[in-house]
Interface confidence: low
């Protein structure tokens, strides 16, 4: 009686159970009543990461430097290449198929969280008492200069983009 289901690591074909090809190998011929499944190893820069009946191995992911990618972990016949982004870039998705440059925080905004290989810069508006006068992917908001501690007075108020301007106190004559 022909089987209707097969054991783990087997597949049903032509009313018989054939062995799947092991990771790193692809299917060339199904088994017959006389022969076992015929499998061949994946070529260079190819892989298959499961027990399978694939007739083609998958190409290793290409970490294209034109897209800002570099190899984090080289692929094998059983694993895909893992890409990450060049310094200063981060992945656009979990699969890291392309990268975008870290954004800079504009004047008036400071860096709340510095970008990583997988997340962009997080900016925050500079609150009262703080400023940022540069466009930067690293700089936080800086506190206004404290004129009092320098025995000076505020001559020009600070903004979220400019520091206060200190000056000498008027001397009473």
């Amino acid at each position: 009686e022909p089987p209707t289901a097969c054991r783990e690591k087997q597949y049903l074909i032509n009313s018989q159970c054939c062995s799947l090809c092991q990771p790193g190998q692809k299917l060339v011929s199904d088994c017959t009543e006389f022969t076992e499944t015929e499998c061949l190893p994946c070529g260079e820069s190819e892989f298959l990461d499961t027990w399978n009946r694939e007739t083609h191995c998958h190409q290793h992911k290409y970490c294209d430097p034109n897209l800002g990618l570099r190899v984090q972990q080289k692929g094998t016949s059983e694993t895909d290449t893992i890409c990450t982004c060049e310094e200063g870039w981060h992945c656009t998705s979990e699969a890291c198929e392309s990268c975008v440059l870290h954004r800079s925080c504009s004047p008036g905004f400071g860096v709340k969280q510095i970008a990583t290989g997988v997340s962009d810069t997080i900016c925050e508006p500079c609150p009262v008492g703080f400023f940022s006068n540069v466009s930067s992917a690293f700089e936080k908001c800086h506190p206004w200069t404290s004129c009092e501690t320098k025995d000076l007075v505020v001559q020009q108020a600070g903004t979220n983009k400019t520091d206060v301007v200190c000056g000498p106190q008027d001397r009473l004559r």
Epitope: K61, D64, P65, N66, L67, E97, S98, V100, L101
Partner: antibody, heavy 115, light 111 residues
Framework: QVQLVQSGAEVKKPGSSVKVSCKAS????????ISWVRQAPGQGLEWMGM????????SYAQKFQGRVTMTRDTSTSTVYMELSSLRPEDTAVYYC????????WGQGTLVTVSS | QSALTQPPSASGSPGQSVTISCTGT?????????VSWYQQHPGNAPKLIIY???KRPSGIPDRFSASKSGNTASLTVSGLQADDEADYYC??????????FGGGTKLTVLG
Amino acid sequence: QVQLVQSGAEVKKPGSSVKVSCKASGGTFSSYAISWVRQAPGQGLEWMGMINPSGGTTSYAQKFQGRVTMTRDTSTSTVYMELSSLRPEDTAVYYCARGFRMDQWGQGTLVTVSS
Amino acid sequence: QSALTQPPSASGSPGQSVTISCTGTSSDVGAYNFVSWYQQHPGNAPKLIIYDVRKRPSGIPDRFSASKSGNTASLTVSGLQADDEADYYCSSYAGNNEMVFGGGTKLTVLG
């Protein structure tokens, strides 16, 4: 080694459109962006924009925004650049090149705009 | 996007060195280490000779070297040869998925 082969020369009338193709072979089509660059006779290189074949996302230079359209056909590993409302000053050799770094170039397509 | 500024011409005798500058702004050359240089012989497509400021694609001789300081990138061709006579273009990433080229420099090998 990626090879980029472009379509042949075109002569167009002012006000019309031109569509230049760039067929890629060798390497995985969806794993690299394609830039388009033009060069007017005796002039320098001018970056027009790019298309990422994997998702079809595009980015165009401000100068060409609204006049250029870049598309791709993954079944034939071909990208296209269409430029509309042609004027005589669009007469140039149009190149496709691989990625932002433009490490591989097509042979170029001469587009002549003349009445 | 304004073009990067290159000298229109440069020259040198065989065996000498010549340096070509490429000046941009703090939004392009100064902002990113993504400067490339191309060599173009008459009637041919450009050819990448330097990328990421100073890296050479395999097959490009080490007579070609490059660097960057502030908003200016430089290409140096040493041990000049007759075949180095060509147009040279710089390009830089300019943010927002845009590239910008220099106006080009015609390099003449004297003699």
